[in-house]
């Protein structure tokens, strides 16, 4: 229903704490360079204003849209043009164009230093001094680095952070309590970020229908006992929630997500038998839990899919008269039978089915034409299954770091024009799929691997879009979202690439590498590996292994040496010479 004051309505629905958190996230995602203090001041002003509207909905400006109110706040920031350049031009526009303009200026790769975690003692001190400010900093720092982070989920991670600090700061050994727990939250939050970015990409590039199809497949896998009408309702609601968050309407998004969680918990009987434990939790935990709830048990008596979608006499009529309903039903029926498939694969199968009907239905004998469509799915299913087997075997053989290196070589050969930092980031993220998915039971591997890879490749596409350098990458990124992963997998060595000149300084290292944390050391070595491949794109795996082993040995020797600097300066050039010879 319409409310006299939108801001008062959202403040009342969400409560002050969540309201403030969401406004802070919104501002941090729009203006990614502003300091926490600048944003905190704006948030306080907006909150105070919301309270006046709660007290009197007819008060001045209370009837304005949230976009107008928030946009006016952002546009009133001093030195906007100096700090943000052409983003300031957005302020010359009227709503809704102004908000669209802000969205277009969100930067997926802002030039901000990595979010460094303070040491345990310092963290606990500032947390105890002012938990609210501490959590505000967390929201601000994450949101500005991840401008599409799913806002209500970020509140959930902040809550997790809070609980971990509350528990660990009371321990004697704070460090060993905090580190693994916070690392766990960080890892989950980073995965959540790339997954949500993929959803926003789907929405932005292909519209609501594409996202809704994704949601139908995902929900049908999770809730195979829910009927099509129920799945459609959930998918429609979920699409609205995500559209709002992707569009910067974070208060509406969080409010509607809470409503959706409430609806699901009130209708468990028609949705799933697995929801009760989630529904017993408080709001943020409940919504999070529902988003990753285990699949319900599949009904035992599901008829063969062919009955309604191949053998039925009305297949073509049903398709032509209501594609959305007919193909939606196909996606629902196929997905509920295949929790072992990735959503990407299910969408490819639905696309293949649609294309087959579009080709066959106008023919003289349509059933003869589309009769083999289900058999034609086989190669589409086998391809990702083989991908999972091959990659998980390789991961088990090499371990995470070795697997990342194998992927780095492969992707540098596919797209050597891409910047080394981007290739290293992508390979490290793609390589984590092993740890994340290959240890799972067989029937969970494929959905885990492919949907995770798709989300990581979406980030590769977003970064490449900013500065397009590789025709290979452009080709894969400009197709449909569900075809990206197979497209990247199918890429081979880029024959058009002219190898990079060998520069000794690229492979020159100093003793400071010895004191770096293990992760940073790995990144340095992987940077060198990518550069080697750019120099010799057709180097064999054996040649690269020889060089990298030599390099690891060199680091080990020099980092153990009494005079590290001398070791690096004398042995370094020898290493470079050996590398050149090995790759000659």
């Amino acid at each position: 229903e319409a409310h006299k004051s939108e801001i008062a309505h959202r403040y009342n629905d969400l409560g002050e704490q969540h309201f403030k958190g969401l406004v802070l996230i919104a501002f941090s995602q729009y203006l990614q360079k502003c300091s926490y203090d600048e944003h905190a001041k704006l948030v306080q002003e907006v909150t105070d204003f919301a309270k006046t509207c709660v007290a009197d909905e007819s008060a001045a400006n209370c009837d304005k849209s949230l976009h107008t109110l928030f946009g006016d706040k952002l546009c009133a920031i001093p030195n906007l043009r100096e700090n943000y350049g052409e983003l300031a031009d957005c302020c010359t526009k009227q709503e809704p164009e102004r908000n669209e303009c802000f969205l277009q200026h969100k930067d997926d790769n802002p030039s901000l230093p990595p979010f460094e975690r303070p040491e345990a003692e310092a963290m606990c001190t500032s947390f105890k001094e002012n938990p609210t400010t501490f959590m505000g900093h967390y929201l601000h720092e994450v949101a500005r680095r991840h401008p599409y982070f799913y806002a209500p989920e970020l509140l959930y991670y902040a809550e997790q952070y809070n609980e971990i600090l509350t528990q660990c700061c009371a321990e004697a050994d704070k460090e060993s309590c905090l580190t693994p727990k916070l690392d766990g939250v960080k890892e989950k939050a980073l995965v959540s970020s790339v997954r949500q970015r993929m959803k926003c990409s789907s929405m932005q590039k292909f519209g609501e229908r594409a996202f809704k199809a994704w949601a139908v497949a995902r929900l049908s896998q999770t809730f195979p006992n829910a009927d099509f009408a129920e799945i459609t309702k959930l998918a429609t609601d979920l699409t609205k929630v995500n559209k709002e968050c992707c569009h910067g309407d974070l208060l509406e998004c969080a409010d509607d997500r809470a409503e959706l969680a409430k609806y699901m918990c009130e209708n468990q009987a028609t949705i799933s038998s697995k929801l009760q434990t989630c529904c017993d939790k408080p709001l943020l935990k409940k919504a999070h839990c529902l988003s990753e709830v285990e699949h319900d048990t599949m009904p035992a008596d599901l008829p063969a899919i062919a009955a309604d979608f191949v053998e039925d006499q009305e297949v073509c009529k049903n398709y032509a008269e209501a594609k959305d309903v007919f193909l939606g039903t196909f996606l629902y029926e196929y997905s509920r039978r295949h929790p072992d498939y990735s959503v990407s694969l299910l969408l490819r199968l639905a696309k293949k089915y649609e294309a087959t009907l579009e080709k066959c239905c106008a023919e003289a004998n349509p059933p003869a034409c589309y009769g083999t469509v289900l058999a034609e799915f086989q190669p589409l299913v086998e391809e990702p299954k083989n991908l999972v087997k091959t990659n998980c075997d390789l991961y088990e053989k090499l371990g995470e770091y070795g697997f990342q290196n194998a992927i780095l070589v492969r992707y540098t050969q596919k797209a050597p024009q891409v910047s080394t930092p981007t290739l290293v980031e992508a390979a490290r993220n793609l390589g984590r799929v092993g740890t994340k998915c290959c240890t799972l039971p067989e029937d969970q591997r494929l959905p885990c691997v492919e949907d995770y890879l798709s989300a990581i490749l979406n980030r590769v596409c977003l970064l490449h879009e900013k500065t397009p350098v590789s025709e290979h990458v452009t080709k894969c990124c400009s197709g449909s979202l569900v075809e990206r992963r197979p497209c990247f997998s199918a890429l081979t060595v880029d024959e058009t690439y002219v190898p990079k000149e060998f520069k000794a300084e690229t492979f020159t290292f100093h003793s400071d590498i010895c004191t770096l944390p293990e992760k940073e050391k790995q990144i340095k070595k992987q940077t060198a590996l990518a550069e080697l491949v750019k120099h010799k794109p057709k180097a064999t795996a054996e040649q690269l292994k020889t060089v990298m082993d030599d390099f690891a040995q060199f680091l080990d020797t020099c980092c153990k040496a009494a005079d590290k600097d001398t070791c690096f300066s004398t042995e370094g050039p020898n290493l470079v010479t050996r590398c050149k010879d090995a790759l000659a």
Epitope: G207, R209, C316, K317, Y319, A320, E321, A322, K323, D324, V325, E354, L357, E358, K359, C360, C361, A362, E363, A364, N365, P366
Partner: antibody, heavy 121, light 110 residues
């Protein structure tokens, strides 16, 4: 050379009926979907309906009930039967083939030259 | 109700000019089922572009189509004398019965 040729147009009184023909030469009609599209003088193109190779028909919502499409593959001809004609049905009527490989998409690659239907008393 | 809005309704241009015609659909077309036709006076329409951006064989490469969902564009990069005509977009939707054409854009000599 593939050709579509409409015939049967002319002057008809309001409330009257008319049957248009679309004779196809150069291809075997039995493999193709044929559409009827009309264009009132100086106005927009308006899709009327389609008949698939199998004989299945679909119509624009406004055309259901008054217009019927049929085909006679032995004569390589498609027909448009129009009943209860009104002044606003005055238009040039075209038949057009759907691009092979599509069934429901608005891609029509071969067109007739059109036949004029005038509904007037 | 399906709406297919073409703009502008007419445009005056000279040989060599770049001409852009837009077509807005409500709701969005199905799966990029969007075509562009060229029609000259007294003649039948001619299919130029299908699937929003694919050129029909024999159509000069100065014609190009782009867009997705609800917003589509036909561009003639360098107008030739034979390009003066009326251009129509056609859209396909979830139901075949909703197949709709725009009302045309007349490209006239300036």
């Amino acid at each position: 050379e593939v050709q579509l040729l409409e015939s049967g147009g002319g002057l008809v009184q309001p409330g009257g009926s008319l049957r248009l023909s679309c004779a196809v030469s150069g291809i075997d009609l039995s493999n193709y979907a044929i559409n009827w599209v009309r264009q009132a003088p100086g106005k927009c193109l308006e899709w009327i309906g389609i008949i698939w190779a199998s004989g299945t028909t679909f119509y624009a919502t406004w055309a259901k009930g008054r217009f019927t499409i049929s085909r006679d593959n032995s004569k390589n001809t498609v027909y448009l039967q129009m009943n209860s004609l009104r002044a606003e049905d005055t238009a040039v009527y075209y038949c057009a083939r759907t691009v092979p490989g599509y069934s429901t998409a608005p891609y029509f690659d071969l067109w007739g030259q059109g036949t004029l239907v005038t509904v007037s008393s | 109700d399906i709406q297919m809005t073409q703009s502008p309704s007419s445009v005056s241009a000279s040989v060599g000019d770049r001409v852009t015609i837009t077509c807005q659909s409500s709701p969005s077309v199905w799966s990029n089922f969007l075509s562009w036709y060229q029609q000259k006076p007294g003649k039948a329409p001619k299919l130029l572009i299908y699937e929003a951006s694919k050129l029909t064989s024999g159509v000069p490469s100065r014609f190009s189509g782009s867009g997705s969902g609800t917003d589509f564009t036909l561009t003639i990069s360098s107008l030739q004398p034979e390009d003066f005509a009326t251009y129509y977009c056609g859209g396909g939707y979830s139901s075949i019965s909703d197949t709709t054409f725009g009302c045309g854009t007349k490209v006239e000599i300036k």
